[in-house]
Interface confidence: low
């Protein structure tokens, strides 16, 4: 039977005044030698020789200083041999613990933590979570770790608080604004011992990044803008609105959107948003008609890319800025409206016989000019001719077989109108529908049913049918179209500048 | 006036690693990202990644994933591209380019030739 | 990874003509949210980096002749160069910046007939 005893020793510190640090006895002894042997770490295994036994009394002293980080306790395996190095016992497994003392201090995981949290959080949010760790015994006061911050910049008020336990660090309150601070530092000791004044400390920064949200209201520059305008003019730099809003530059938070609450009601406007710069360019996409509207009053307002963050959603209330526009006439001189007609020449019309009139309107007046002359342009088959002061087109000659094989029974010519003071040309479109001769030796063709117009853009076939009664001084018919878009399109009047 | 400035030509063997530099002028250095963009010789463009030099943040192509690091030295305006374990198809002039986020680069280096090779 | 596919490869057109260049995407690169088209066209010159000259798909970059037009939303983009300059010889990319990895179209070469 083993009869043990053994103490425990304590790191860092000299053992010797405590040896022998155990001892061991077999009961054997009493009527025999017995040797007694040890073995394990600390023993015949690194780190060697710390215990050493008395072979003859069984006791085990310790020679040498350990450290309970490295060993936190060590397995004496024991043996009682007889003269024949017989086991008189079962091998003893004797536990010799190490006592910790706080040789150990804290450890961060980081020497600087990276956090962010929104501006305007609420109180108590978490923004991030220390790590530390203390080498020392766990569960032991020497590797209890409290936080506390020492440091915050900038120092104006504090603004975070940490769980000394967890090492939570929290918003104070919910006053942070990043249009503030950006940023902030803080540095936070961990101490162990609980933050005994015994204890070992070390320290860590935190760089808490302060996160924009959309808790201002952008605003215009100016509260109202007056601009002049051409009609008839696209301009693609009217004006600049400048936006100012303090949020994160270049963030969805801090560009704006503005737009029309009014007034643009014909969409002749657009604000073309310039993101680098949160400029707005006010744009003429749609030409202004100064006849139709001398001046008009634009209402803007301006938001953001980005919702509004839910802390300032009261406070918004739409600003409108005013942009009076007042429209400047151009003088624009006659053009064809509508810029294509067709006409229709029946059989039995003869030299000098009206076709129709083709007159040029006076834009400024909306009347027919009365400063130009006409002439015809392209004129194939050489088959009209017009009245250079009226616009009155009439037959040249009767149209023969030639003519109308060669046309096809459909003519398309050009008439110009010339304003020699303004030096502007401006072309309208001749369509002729040459009806059939009937049993007339002079056609061969069938009755033709279709028009042709031309706005000056396209072509379109319309099929019509036709009244072929006529009468001796204007026996033709009249059918004109509207160019598309209605509005005053200077490509679909087919205007000229120059001689 | 806004200007990139890449290092020089290097020639580099297998295995080894460069690192390009890209030295901006003329604009607020923080306000912008600047891309890498290579091109390989006689062919197209290939993106390889984007630092902002706001915040640090950055985006790598996925094939170049693990090799390359982008870096910005705000005192010196300075963005560093490394790449390391070079093969020889990594032979290609470099690029860099400025922009806010990931398109729309409106100002470019003269570019740097890496040569790969044995 | 979003694919672009230009077409033609190599274009050949007298001074004075247009040219057309097509840039289709495997997949869209508008974005719902801005309604915009992530997708730029650059020029390249021999020995020169690559020159941004529209933006947006149709957004001239500054300084950048009105001569190039870009047209085009969601998968099928044109540049087109009216009356084509000697100086606009060089190879025409397309590169889109909707998703990651970003992507450049293989480019067209424009050169005078």
């Known amino acids: 039977e083993w009869i043990k005893f053994a103490a425990a020793c304590r790191e860092g510190e000299d053992n010797s005044k405590r040896n022998p640090i155990a001892k061991i006895h077999s009961d054997c002894a009493a009527n025999q030698q017995v040797t007694y042997r040890i073995s394990g770490v600390g023993i015949d295994q690194p780190p060697y020789g710390i215990f050493v036994i008395n072979q003859k009394t069984g006791e085990i002293n310790i020679t040498s200083i350990v450290d309970r980080e490295v060993t936190p306790f060590f397995i004496i395996y024991c043996r009682a041999l007889n003269s024949m190095g017989q086991d008189l016992e079962r091998p003893l497994e004797l536990r010799v613990r190490v006592l910790d003392i706080n040789d150990n201090p804290p450890v961060f995981s980081m020497a600087t933590f990276a956090g962010q949290i929104e501006e305007n959080s609420n109180a108590n949010t978490l923004v991030m979570i220390l790590n530390a760790t203390d080498a020392d015994e766990p569960n032991n006061l020497n590797s209890k770790i409290a936080f506390k911050i020492i440091r915050q910049e900038p120092s104006d008020s504090p603004m975070f608080i940490i769980n000394r336990n967890t090492g939570e660090i929290r918003t104070m309150n919910n006053f942070l604004d990043r249009e503030q601070y950006g940023q902030y530092a803080l540095a936070v000791r961990g101490s162990d011992r609980d933050g005994g004044a015994d204890g070992m400390s070390a320290e860590c920064e935190c760089n808490i990044k302060i996160l924009d949200v959309n808790d201002n209201i952008p605003y215009m520059e100016q509260s109202s803008y007056t601009i002049e305008i051409q009609e008839n003019t696209l301009n693609s730099n009217l004006l600049e609105i400048r936006v100012i809003d303090l949020d994160e530059e270049f963030s969805a938070n801090w560009m704006a959107v503005i737009f029309f609450i009014s007034g643009n009601e014909g969409n002749w406007f657009e604000i073309e948003m310039n993101e680098r710069t949160n400029v707005g360019i006010l744009k003429v996409v749609k030409p202004l008609d100064y006849e139709a509207m001398q001046s008009l009053q634009l209402s803007i307002g301006v938001r953001n890319k980005a919702e509004f963050h839910h802390s300032i959603m009261s406070q918004y209330k739409l600003k409108a800025s005013a942009i009076s526009v007042t429209v400047l006439n151009v003088i624009e001189g006659p053009v064809f409206r509508p810029g294509s007609k067709t006409y229709v020449v029946t059989g039995n019309m003869g030299s000098n016989d009206k076709v129709g009139d083709f007159v040029a309107t006076d834009l400024d007046t909306g009347r027919p000019s009365t400063t130009v002359r006409y002439v015809m342009g392209n004129n194939p088959a050489d088959l009209l001719a017009v009245d250079s002061r009226t616009g009155k087109l009439t037959l040249k000659n009767k149209v023969t077989k030639e003519q109308y094989n060669m046309l096809g029974g459909k003519y398309q010519g050009t008439i110009l109108s010339i304003d020699d003071n303004l030096q502007r040309t401006c072309t309208g479109t001749i369509n002729i529908n040459i009806q059939s001769f009937g049993n007339d030796d002079r056609t061969n063709t069938e009755p033709n049913t279709k028009i042709t117009t031309n706005t000056g853009r396209q072509e379109s076939t319309s099929s019509t049918n036709y009244d072929t009664s006529t009468t001796s001084t204007d026996s033709s018919q009249v059918y004109s179209s509207e160019p598309g878009n209605g509005a005053k399109d200077l490509l679909s009047d087919n205007v000229h500048f120059g001689p | 006036q806004v200007q990139l400035v890449q290092s020089g030509a290097e020639v580099k063997k297998p295995g080894a690693l460069v690192k390009v530099s890209c030295k901006a002028s003329g604009y607020t250095f923080t306000n912008y990202g600047i891309t890498w963009v290579r091109q390989a010789p006689g062919q197209g463009l290939e993106w390889m990644g984007w630092?902002?030099?706001?915040?640090?943040?950055?985006k790598y192509a996925q094939k170049l994933q693990g090799r390359v690091t982008m870096t910005t030295d705000t005192p010196t305006n300075t963005v560093y591209m490394e790449l390391r374990s070079l093969r020889s198809d990594d032979t290609a002039v470099y690029y860099c380019?400025?922009?806010?986020?990931?398109?729309?680069?409106?100002?470019w280096g003269q570019g740097t030739l890496v040569t790969v090779s044995s | 990874e979003l694919v672009l596919t230009q077409s033609p490869d190599s274009l050949s057109v007298s001074l004075g003509e247009r040219a057309t260049i097509n840039c289709k995407s495997s997949?869209?690169?508008?974005?719902?949210?801005?309604?915009?088209?992530?997708l730029s066209w650059y020029q390249q010159k021999p020995g020169q980096p690559p020159k941004l000259i529209m933006n947006w798909a149709s957004i001239r970059a500054s300084g950048v002749p009105d001569r190039f037009s870009g047209s085009g939303s969601g998968t099928d983009f044109t540049l087109t160069i009216n009356s084509l300059q000697a100086e606009d010889v060089a190879i025409y990319y397309c590169q889109q910046y909707y998703s990651t990895p970003l992507t450049f179209g293989g480019g067209t070469k424009v050169e005078i007939k």
């Open positions: 630092i902002s030099v706001y915040n640090g943040d950055t």
């Open positions: 380019a400025r922009g806010y986020g990931s398109g729309n680069w409106d100002y």
């Open positions: 997949q869209t690169v508008l974005y719902n949210s801005d309604n915009k088209n992530y």
